[in-house]
Interface confidence: low
């Protein structure tokens, strides 16, 4: 066959769907690879063809669109399963072509099983709620396009295994779940089950997401440098190892980049000739406030190194701070034999 622009297997879009539930999968060509949409392609006379490779097979085969009750169908650039079966797992390819043009991409589809408490190998999206921040809502995700607006589905929300009713601060509001005042105890997995009718059948959509209660922007502060500080002096003799920790506390801030760095005599360590290493560790509180520690290390410090300026810097969306470490050369203790000799007038 003639050449086809093959975008390969798009593993970035590993699609996971639950067994025995409807699934609608858009051809990724139009979303991520081509500069035109399906309507444009269709009106230009291009045809969208679907085929697949079963799990643990190499053979590409056409998708059977003649199954009972139209279990698998295609509508525009969407491949529909009503519903999925476990053995639908595999790599799916959509190909757009006419006599002069061809472009295709493959993507993995995994049909996963869930238990009665909605546990499964599904990768869960994380929704962050601010602690004690007034009413916040999460919305049942990825249900658009499954039923027309004229259909009123029933929606049931669960936290873990338990149906949400009589909860202190969580109220089901249709597609939304409202948290009156989010607390650490609200951390967990929340599932919405959307039930809707279609052509005399009843379908269920199960969507689980992880709620993580994080620090509120109301309480956020600029970075706080705990170390170095004015109370600790790094006193070393030449030849010893110099270790200076820079420990910084960052309030949680949504989408903020937290940065810590050292300067030595106003320059980044990479820009100077001394043999310095920097190791970083990061820890988080329950509300995702962050503590970063960068340890500056010079294995064998020289007297020149002990005269340099070592400054720890930190920056977040809330501001930038800096603190210099107090570094000095240790005054050597008097050498006993020499002093004695001098004291007795020895020559």
């Amino acid at each position: 066959s003639e050449r086809c622009d093959d975008w390969g297997l798009d593993t970035m879009r590993q699609i996971q769907v639950f067994e025995d539930e409807p699934a609608r999968i858009k051809c990724p060509l139009f979303e991520h690879f081509l500069k035109f949409n399906y309507s444009t392609a269709h009106s230009a006379g291009l045809t969208l063809i679907w085929y697949w490779t079963r799990q643990d097979r190499d053979l590409e085969e056409p998708i059977n669109f003649r199954l009972p009750e139209n279990r698998i169908s295609k509508e525009k650039d969407v491949l529909w399963f009503r519903p999925t079966l476990l053995n639908d797992t595999g790599n799916y390819t959509c190909m757009l072509r006419n006599t002069t043009y061809c472009s295709k991409v493959a993507f993995p589809l995994e049909v996963v099983q869930k238990d009665s408490c909605f546990n499964s190998p599904m990768k869960l999206p994380v929704h962050k709620l601010y602690i004690e921040y007034g009413i916040q809502r999460i919305t049942c995700p990825n249900v658009d396009g499954y039923f027309p607006s004229s259909v009123k589905p029933t929606i049931t929300w669960y936290m873990g295994c338990y149906k949400i009713q009589n909860f202190n601060n969580v109220i089901p509001e249709g597609m939304n779940l409202s948290f009156l005042i989010a607390l650490i105890s609200n951390n967990g997995n929340y599932t919405c089950v959307v039930t809707y009718p279609e052509n005399g059948r009843t379908f269920h959509l199960t969507r689980t997401l992880t709620v993580k209660v994080v620090g509120s922007p109301k309480n956020a502060v600029p970075p706080v440098i705990h170390s170095p500080n004015d109370h600790v002096v790094y006193e070393k003799e030449p030849g010893e190892e110099l270790l200076i920790p820079c420990t910084v506390y960052f309030s949680f801030l949504m989408d903020s980049r937290n940065e810590v760095w050292w300067t030595i005599d106003g320059k980044k360590p990479d820009d100077i000739t001394i043999d310095v290493t920097i190791n970083e560790s990061i820890s988080h509180s329950r509300t995702e406030d962050e503590t970063r520690t960068q340890i500056l290390s010079i294995k064998k410090v020289t007297s020149e190194d002990l005269k340099r300026s070592y400054v720890c810097h930190a920056r977040s969306a809330k501001g930038e701070v800096a603190k210099a470490a107090k570094v000095k050369q240790k005054v050597p203790a008097p050498r006993y034999t020499v002093e004695l000799a001098c004291g007795f007038g020895a020559t």
Epitope: S149, K152, I164, Q165, I171, P172, E173, G174
Partner: antibody, heavy 121, light 112 residues
């Protein structure tokens, strides 16, 4: 921010028809209920009915069923309250209000400025 | 339909003093989900009503914390811890458990 802007005051004669409007902005109009509330001169609030613009699902108070029609056009984010034949007793201030729906209940978190309807011969 | 009865009809208040309004429903407003479906609204003179409290005890956005709501399934109370001059107007309770939604007759709060 959320806003509900109602049409202006109306003076009508008994037997005439009327349609007043309520335009929503600053939020997803299709996905919140819009309720209508009547306040007769010097009196309290009376709930007339409610509509879900997403699919035009409408509920009426029995006192107003058949007396008024509630409708919505989600394409222009507008809800309507209409009468086919006004009576003098329809003289009142009419408010539209956005309804939140927690579970199966409503609360009205945003209100229009009101439309004064006067019916007099 | 559920009948809502408010008392008192009129409440003269002194700024800085507390105030309390009662609302009684003809049947329980306690939903099976554990929430009490009662809202409180304030209509200031010449203005549209505004939401103060929803689901019995939750303050709406922007409502000062001097306002609080409480109650059982049928007896509800709106409290103002320290009345301010701007709190004058007519207070309405509304049951939100089932349609038709019904309002109480209102309590007029005025400065002594």
């Amino acid at each position: 921010q959320v806003q509900l802007v109602q049409s202006g005051a109306e003076v009508k004669k008994p037997g005439e028809s009327l349609k007043i409007s309520c335009k929503g902005s600053g939020y997803s109009f299709s996905s919140h209920w819009i309720g209508w509330v009547r306040q007769m001169p010097g009196k309290g609030l009376e709930w007339m009915g409610i509509i879900y613009p997403g699919d035009s699902d409408t509920r009426y108070s029995p006192s107003f069923q058949g007396q008024v029609t509630i409708s919505a056009d989600k394409s222009i984010s507008t809800a309507y309250l209409q009468w086919s034949s006004l009576k003098a007793s329809d003289t009142a201030m009419y408010y539209c209000a956005r309804g939140e729906l927690p579970g199966e209940a409503y609360y009205f978190d945003n209100w229009g400025q009101g439309t004064l309807v006067t019916v007099s011969s | 339909e559920i009948v809502m009865t408010q008392s008192p009809l009129s409440l003269p208040v002194t700024p800085g003093e507390p105030a309390s309004i009662s609302c009684r429903s003809s049947q329980s407003l306690l939903h099976s989900n554990g929430y009490k479906y009662l809202d409180w609204y304030l209509q200031k003179p010449g203005q549209s009503p505004q939401l103060l409290i929803y689901l019995g005890s939750n303050r709406a956005s922007g409502v000062p914390d001097r306002f609080s709501g409480s109650g059982s399934g049928t007896d509800f109370t709106l409290k103002i811890s320290r009345v301010e001059a701007e709190d004058v107007g007519v207070y309405y309770c509304m049951q939100a458990l089932q349609t038709p939604l019904t309002f109480g007759g209102g309590t007029k709060v005025e400065i002594k």
